[in-house]
Interface confidence: medium
C-alpha cells in the first residue's frame, strides 16, 4: 500500500472548480506534514505550485495565481489542491508530496524523489 494515494484521473468543465485529493496512509498523520503540489504539462518540467501546512503557514509558488489553493483535512488524512475557474492550460499532471513544514527548495526536491505519486487532472471542454 503506497504512502500517498491520488486518483489516476479527474475531469471537470471549463470555468468550474476541481479539487484534487492526496491521501496519506493512515499509519502517518497529515497533521504534522506540509502538503506540496506540483504541476507538469506535457513536454515541460514539473512546476512547484504551492505548499500548505495550515491557513497561517502556507506558500504559493512564483507566478502561481490564487485560483490554485491548498487545504488539508486532518480527520481524513488528506491534502487537497483546489483549482478554480478551470482553464484549458490547467490540463496537466498534478503531483502531491508530503514533507516537513520547511519550504526549502532542497527539501521539496527530496520529497519529489521519495514520495511522489501522480494524479492527472484533465479538463473536459464542453
Amino acid at each position: 500500500q503506497p504512502v500517498l494515494h491520488q486518483p489516476p484521473a479527474m475531469s471537470s468543465a471549463l470555468g468550474t472548480t476541481i479539487r484534487l485529493t492526496c491521501t496519506l496512509r493512515n499509519d502517518h498523520d497529515i497533521g504534522v506534514y506540509s502538503v506540496y503540489w506540483y504541476q507538469q504539462r506535457p513536454g515541460h518540467p514539473p512546476r512547484f505550485l504551492l505548499r500548505y501546512f495550515s491557513q497561517s503557514d502556507k506558500s504559493q509558488g512564483p507566478q502561481v495565481p490564487p485560483r490554485f489553493s491548498g487545504s488539508k483535512d486532518v480527520a481524513r488524512n488528506r491534502g487537497y489542491l483546489s483549482i478554480s475557474e478551470l482553464q484549458p492550460e490547467d490540463e496537466a499532471m498534478y503531483y502531491c508530496a508530503m514533507g516537513a513544514r520547511s519550504s526549502e527548495k532542497e527539501e521539496r526536491e527530496r520529497e519529489w524523489e521519495e514520495e511522489m505519486e501522480p494524479t492527472a487532472a484533465r479538463t473536459r471542454v464542453p
Epitope: 500500500q1 503506497p2 494515494h5 471537470s12 472548480t17 491521501t23 493512515n26 480527520a75 481524513r76 488524512n77
Partner: antibody, heavy 122, light 107 residues
C-alpha cells in the same frame, strides 16, 4: 463478508442514557472511518457523528453535540455511541456505517448495519 | 454546515419512465456527492459515489451527474424494484449532511 451489527437500542425516559454498540467483522476495522446515522420514524436520514480510523478525529451534528459521545475500540472491532440527556426528538433507528477504504477517492457509506431502534418516551 | 436541498420530495411515475432527481448544495462541494436508495425497513444502499460513479452491482439505468452545487440522479427506465426513497449526501467535509429525500412511488 463485511458485517456491521448494532445493538443497545431500547426504550428510555427523557433525560436518560443509552450506549449503542456496532460490532464489525469481515474487514480490517482499524483502517476505516466510521459514522452513526439516524432516521426518525417516517423521516429522512440524519448524520449524527463520525470518527476517524485511528479515533483521533471526531465530529458531531449540532443536534447532539455535548450530549452524545462517539468512540471506537479497534482491538475489539467495535464502534460505540454513548447517548446522554436523551430527548423525545432523539427517537430514531440508529445505523452505523462504514466509509469506503482510504485509497478510494470519495467518502460514501458503502456498508451499513441493520439499525437499532432507540425510543425516548415517558 | 453545508445544506442539501433535494427536489422533488415526492415523485409519482410509471414503470419505464425516465426519472430525474435534483440535489442542490448551499456551497460548492466539487464532486463530493453520493446517492443512496432506501426501501422501507431497510438500511440505505450506496448507488452513486463522487457524483457520477456507479457503485459495483448497481444497474446501469442509474446515473449521476453534476459538480459544484448542482447534481442530478437519473433513472433511465424505471423498474418495479426502483420504487423507493432516494437521498443525496455530501462528503465534502464533516459534518456530513443528507438531502431531505425523494420518494418515488408508482403512478
Amino acid at each position: 463478508e463485511v458485517q456491521l451489527v448494532e445493538s443497545g437500542g431500547g426504550l428510555v425516559k427523557p433525560g436518560g442514557s443509552l450506549r449503542l454498540s456496532c460490532a464489525a467483522s469481515g474487514f480490517t476495522f482499524s483502517n476505516f472511518e466510521m459514522n452513526w446515522v439516524r432516521q426518525a420514524p417516517g423521516k429522512g436520514l440524519e448524520w449524527v457523528s463520525g470518527i476517524s480510523s485511528n479515533g483521533r478525529y471526531i465530529n458531531y451534528a449540532d443536534s447532539v453535540k455535548g450530549r452524545f459521545t462517539i468512540s471506537r475500540d479497534n482491538a475489539k472491532n467495535s464502534l460505540y455511541l454513548q447517548m446522554n440527556s436523551l430527548r423525545a426528538e432523539d427517537t430514531a433507528v440508529y445505523y452505523c456505517a462504514r466509509v469506503v477504504d482510504f485509497d478510494q477517492d470519495y467518502n460514501g457509506f458503502d456498508y451499513w448495519g441493520q439499525g437499532t431502534l432507540v425510543t425516548v418516551s415517558s | 454546515d453545508i445544506q442539501l436541498t433535494q427536489s422533488p420530495s415526492f415523485l409519482s411515475a410509471s414503470v419505464g419512465d425516465r426519472v430525474t432527481i435534483t440535489c442542490r448544495a448551499s456551497q460548492g462541494i466539487s464532486t463530493d456527492l453520493n446517492w443512496y436508495q432506501q426501501k422501507p425497513g431497510k438500511a440505505p444502499k450506496l448507488l452513486i459515489y463522487a457524483a457520477s460513479n456507479l457503485e459495483s452491482g448497481v444497474p446501469s439505468r442509474f446515473s449521476g451527474s453534476g459538480s459544484g452545487t448542482e447534481f442530478t440522479l437519473t433513472i433511465s427506465s424505471l423498474q418495479p424494484e426502483d420504487f423507493a426513497t432516494y437521498y443525496c449526501q455530501q462528503s465534502y467535509n464533516w459534518p456530513y449532511t443528507f438531502g431531505g429525500g425523494t420518494k418515488v412511488e408508482i403512478k
